[in-house]
Each structure stands twice: as C-alpha cells, then as structure tokens.
C-alpha cells in the first residue's frame, strides 16, 4: 500500500516517497512510480544549504560597500556569502546587513576589548590607580605614574581621567 511516512532525506507526494534534492541543487520534478526526483544545480550566484524540495535556489547575500560591507567568505552552491564590515566599522546585527563606526571609549574609560568587523568596542571604567584622558577606540586605561620610583612625591592626586602630578620632595624639613 502507498506509504504514509518516508525515510530521512525523502518527502511524501502523490502517495510516493521521493528523494529530496541534495544541498546545492533545486527540485525540477517530483518522482513518480517510475522515475526518480529530478534536481538541477543552483547557478553561480545562488545556493541551497539543506536537503530540499525547493523549486528555486536562494540568491547569495550581497555585501553592499555603500553600507560598509565587504565579503568575508564567498558563497558556494551550498552556502551563503558571509559579509563583514570594513576597517573601523562593525555589524549592526548577527546577520550583518549594515555597518556602523566603532564607538570610542570616553575619558575615564578604557578599551576592554577592541572592536572587530562583527563586534563593537567594549569599554570599562578605569579603576583606582588607572586613568584615560582621551576618547579612543584602542587605548586601555593607563596606570598612574609612580612618583616614588622617580624619587618624587605626589603633588596632585590622580583621577580616572587624569594622571597624578609628581613634584620634588620638600628638602627644608
């Protein structure tokens, strides 16, 4: 009797279990009692990444340079193109459909993790003993100058935005 369920990589149509098309190929015609499923390879600009019964392949993603995108990995008949962002930019989402400039860490904050094509700059507040006096996408918090090692004394305390000010020791005492 005609099947009601089919094996893996098959589909049921007109009471027949037909083979799915392999990744990289699209369905041309369903199988019959007497013939196999017929599949055709996707064209150069298209792909299908699963066993399927699609009659059309999907277009490869376009990495639009006007949106700051560039090709990270060229698509094949079985995989989509992977886009990434140009230098100084990162993706706005996981699917990387557009790019925005990396943010800079404001004074008082340092770079914890430098941005990549797919992730933004991660900033952290400068802890006690460290400072950042610039707005930068690269600079970490720097340690306060150690006056003692220079045989100097602290004349003005440091903050998260400023270094300590060292001065000579008072020799009159």
């Amino acid at each position: 009797e005609p099947p009601t369920a089919c094996r893996e990589k098959q589909y049921l149509i007109n009471s027949q279990c037909c083979s799915l098309c392999q990744p990289g190929q699209k369905l041309v015609s369903d199988c019959t009692e007497f013939t196999e499923t017929e599949c055709l390879p996707c064209s150069e600009s298209e792909f299908l990444d699963t066993w399927n019964r699609e009659t059309r392949c999907h277009q490869h993603k376009y990495c639009d340079p006007n949106l700051g995108l560039q090709v990270q990995q060229k698509g094949t008949s079985e995989t989509d193109t992977i886009c990434t962002c140009e230098e100084g930019l990162h993706c706005t989402s996981e699917s990387c459909e557009s790019c925005v400039p990396h943010r800079s860490c404001l004074p008082g904050f340092g770079v914890k993790q430098i941005a990549t094509g797919v992730s933004d700059t991660i900033c952290e507040p400068c802890p006690v003993g460290f400072f950042s006096n610039v707005s930068s996408a690269f600079e970490k918090c720097r340690p306060w100058t150690s006056c003692e090692t220079k045989d100097l004394v602290v004349q003005q305390a440091g903050t998260n935005k400023t270094d300590v000010v060292c001065g000579p020791q008072d020799r009159q005492r």
């Epitope: 083979s19 015609s29 019959t32 007497f34 013939t35 196999e36």
Partner: antibody
Framework: EVQLQESGPGLVKPSETLSLTCTVS?????????WNWIRQPPGKGLEWMGY???????NYNPSLKNRVTISRDTSKNQFSLKLSSVTAADTAVYYC?????WGQGTTVTVSS | DVVMTQTPLSLSVTPGQPASISCRSS???????????LNWYLQKPGQSPQLLIY???NRFSGVPDRFSGSGSGTDFTLKISRVEAEDVGVYYC?????????FGQGTKLEIK
Amino acid sequence: EVQLQESGPGLVKPSETLSLTCTVSGYSITSNYYWNWIRQPPGKGLEWMGYIRYDGSNNYNPSLKNRVTISRDTSKNQFSLKLSSVTAADTAVYYCARLDYWGQGTTVTVSS
Amino acid sequence: DVVMTQTPLSLSVTPGQPASISCRSSQSLENTNGNTFLNWYLQKPGQSPQLLIYRVSNRFSGVPDRFSGSGSGTDFTLKISRVEAEDVGVYYCLQVTHVPFTFGQGTKLEIK
C-alpha cells in the same frame, strides 16, 4: 482519471513512414511523467520504442536504428510517433502509455 | 540492454491455489539512490496491459491484495495468493531503471 487514445492510419505501405498520435486527457503532458510508445507484434511480447518527457526531451530504443521520432503538441496535449522506412516486421498493435495508464492500442499493418 | 527473463513461460493453476512468476534481470535494477524500478503487468485477452505492481512491491490503485511483488537486485517475483478465473492472461515484468526499458517475454496463466 488519466486517459490516452491512439489515432492514425491502420495501413502503411512498406518503406513509408508510420505516423500515430496519442491524445491525453485528465493530465498535462508537461506536468510530469514520461510519455511512451510501446508496440506488440501479432502473437508476440511487448517492445518499448521510446518516450518523450514532460520537458520535451526524448529517449529511444537503439534497436529501432534511428527510425523513430517522438514529438509533442502541448497546445493539444498530444504526443506523436513517427517510424520511418517501415517493413512487414513493423506490423503490430501500437500503444501509447504513461506506464500506469495505457491507451487501448491501435493496429497498424504494413503491406503494399 | 538489460535482458529480462521470465519463468515459467506458462502455467496452469487451479482456482484458489497460489501462483508464482519469476523475473530475472541481466544486471542490477537498483539505482544509485537505492530505488528499483521494476513493474508487473497483466494483459488480459484482447486488452491493453494493466499495471499491477510498481517499484518491485507497491500495488497499483485498485489491484486486489492477492497480488504481491518482492525481490531486489536482479531477482524478482510476482505472487498470486489465490488465483481467480479473472486472473487469466499474460503477465509481463518491465524494468524502467535503465534505458532502453525492457520487458520480460511474458508468462501465460491459464485456469485448470
């Protein structure tokens, strides 16, 4: 219900071309399946002659030595058989078939 | 071409008794996907062949369940569990895995 019906002359002279048409109802010949011609000489078994596919491409039995052509008229949902340079050995009942559904057959006699 | 050999060429069976027909191919009928395209037909006297079994073991719609097909590779069998008077005729196997499609020479079933 899929139905197939053969039509054409019942008598053909030797060396001439046998021409038959199969009219299909209940299914489009461009949708799927292979549309076949099969013949049966008197008192003998069945011989596959060839097919035309849903997409218009063909396959023929090499034993017929390039004498056979199968074509189609999609506007009439028909496919046709031409067999050239016939001899008495081509006398047979000719069937058109989708392999699950068959026509009732038409007898063609080759004689002068 | 794939040669299909049927045995026996004729058999006489008492109504209600079983019958079995063998069909052997000269090469495997299993394709690269693991599917085997082997059909069984019955041609009753004066009629077109009618499909009984396709893909070795699948009964065509409306075919009584006393008909069953089995086999793989090069060795196939059609069984009739209890023969009835209406089962008389010539049984053919047909392979459609390889082009050209080829029929067995036929097995004539008659009632005792």
